[in-house]
């Protein structure tokens, strides 16, 4: 009966026409929502003026459905037995789901301001930058609404600036109208063992930000993983979001919807320092802002997003060091609201359900040369907002995979 | 490569005026930002006037503002900078610089010396 079974599960979740696995792959049953929390800027100008602690409130949820659209230029290649794809980006807003509008206005910190005097550091460029910054009426802070704020504005301060600069700002943007990838995934046709698991992301199967292991492209993108998924496993997978391959580790067994799936979770290992996990060295890029790779829990992704100073974070800074924090007040971390986990189903693999947990931040430094930036004492690592992505599969869904899988091995 | 050459430089009496020009070459001027910076003796290179690529924005030091004027022209690949009411305060090496975002630094010019005294 077992080599029956395993027989038949090797034979569904296979990535080609015809299997469970592809119909599902291709275009997710599953419906996937990211939603945001801002953190709304309550003491913009004592922060500029004095170098005040930032002191934060988050608003939100404001809820958008993605994931909704089919993987595009789905091409099998049966020479190294690989399938390849773009997963075209979407986001419609939920007002139902959200606690506002789109057109609901936050006081956050300057995008452009903080990345241009980050970019550019020689104090000729930044006598020019502070010219234009104060000719656009810029500031440290700026008021925005959420749709500029995630998905873009014409920034007065970039309009200035001369040729070759993009004047829109937002922190997805572009984002409609874009895809990720190509990624190039194993299709287990000839070894299921394999099956998901990425070969290589745009062409490589490296990704040219980090140096040595941190540099790899490891595992499948966490939408499923090769079956027979043991608790003993350390689950590898890549994720563009985070410009970086990541893992996740047996936690607990979890009953959803009367299937037996394994949580697995991010680990707080993860994100540690090389002072504590010493394979985490080639995650530290430069030595201020890491105080010599003592700090933990953000990591800089400036080189994957064109030198811009963003800091991926787990939200409210979990399992990020005090000194990351301290400058910012209205933090309220917790594991059960802020980790990563997947709820992984072990006989195919399939993530049933998950929730993908980061927060964005980005670095604003004093700067003797900027008017907006001169009374600052100390770098800050400035939380912008928080997002949470969840997906879980639908009872219909559910009660299929109990009959099919689940049901015919108990 | 590269050049810009400053001209227009001399000893003036205070009230009176200069006009200071820079010819640039090796590069698509229209695409710059075209500034004009002075380092005094014993202090700190500081920017005097900017003018943006299109050339619809200029800015001023606070203390050159009314007084002094940047203008370009692209078809000449030129940039100036009137200079009235001449200040002995104003005495410094004036020096021309073109700069986009592609540049982690400006390009600079050598410069040209003005003297404010009677």
């Known amino acids: 009966g077992d080599l029956l079974i395993q027989k038949t599960i090797k034979k569904q979740v296979v990535l080609e026409e015809g299997t469970i696995a592809f119909k599902n792959w291709v275009k997710t049953g599953t419906e996937v929502y990211r939603q945001f929390w801002i953190f709304d800027v309550q003491n913009p100008q004592e922060v500029m003026m004095n170098s005040s602690n930032i002191q934060v409130k988050q608003r939100g949820p404001y809820t958008y459905r993605v994931r909704f659209l089919a993987k595009e230029n789905v091409t099998q290649d049966a020479e190294d037995n690989t399938v390849s794809f773009l997963q075209p980006n979407g986001a419609i807003f939920e007002p139902s789901l959200s606690v506002g509008t789109e057109a609901d206005n936050f006081t956050v910190l300057n995008l452009a301001v903080a990345a241009a005097s980050h970019i550019y550091q020689n104090q000729f460029v930044q006598m020019i930058l502070n010219s234009l910054i104060n000719k656009s009426k810029s500031s440290m802070f700026q008021v925005r609404t959420l749709r500029e704020l995630l998905w873009g504005y014409r920034d007065p301060f970039l309009s200035l600036v001369p040729y070759p600069v993009t004047t829109t700002v937002g922190l997805f943007y572009p984002y409609n109208n874009t895809a990720d990838g190509v990624y190039k995934v194993f299709n287990g046709k000839d070894n299921i063992s394999k099956v998901a698991i990425i070969d290589t992301y745009k062409g490589k199967r490296n990704l040219s930000y980090w140096e040595s292991h941190c540099d790899m492209i490891n595992g499948t993108d966490a939408a499923s993983f090769p079956p027979f998924v043991e608790k003993s496993q350390v689950l590898q997978f890549f994720s563009s979001d985070i410009c970086r391959s990541i893992y996740a580790v047996f936690e607990s067994d979890v009953n959803l919807k009367g299937i037996p799936v394994y949580r697995f979770v991010l680990p707080s290992k993860a994100f540690a320092s090389p002072v504590e996990n010493p394979d985490n060295y080639c995650f530290c890029t430069e030595k201020i802002i890491s105080k010599n790779c003592t700090s933990y829990g953000v990591l800089d992704i400036s080189k994957c997003k064109e030198g811009r100073p963003v800091y991926i974070s787990l939200p409210h800074f979990l399992y990020a060091s005090p000194d990351v924090s301290e400058p910012i007040d209205g933090l309220n971390p917790n594991e059960e609201e802020h980790r990563t986990y997947l709820d992984i189903e072990p006989i195919t693999g399939f993530t049933l359900q998950f929730a993908k947990r980061l927060q964005v931040n980005l670095l604003v430094k004093p700067s003797e040369k900027i008017q907006v930036l001169k009374n600052l004492k100390r770098n800050y690592i400035v939380p912008i907002l928080w997002l949470n992505e969840t997906g879980t599969i639908g009872d219909e869904k559910a009660n299929m995979f109990r009959s099919q899988v689940t049901g015919k091995i108990n | 490569q590269v050049q810009l050459q400053e001209s227009g430089g001399g000893l003036v009496q205070p009230g009176g005026s200069l006009r200071l020009s820079c010819a640039a070459s090796g590069f698509t001027f229209s695409s710059y930002a075209m500034s004009w910076y002075r380092q005094a003796p014993g202090k700190e290179r500081e920017l005097v006037a900017l003018?943006?690529?299109?050339?619809?924005?200029?800015d001023y030091a606070d203390s050159v503002k009314g007084r002094f004027t940047i203008s370009r022209d692209d078809a000449e690949k030129t940039v100036s900078l009137q200079m009235n009411s001449l200040k002995p305060e104003d005495t410094a090496v004036y020096y021309c610089s073109a700069w986009r975002a592609s540049l982690y630094e400006p390009y600079w010019g050598q410069g040209t010396q003005v003297t404010v005294s009677s």
């Open positions: 003018i943006t690529s299109a050339g619809g924005t200029t």
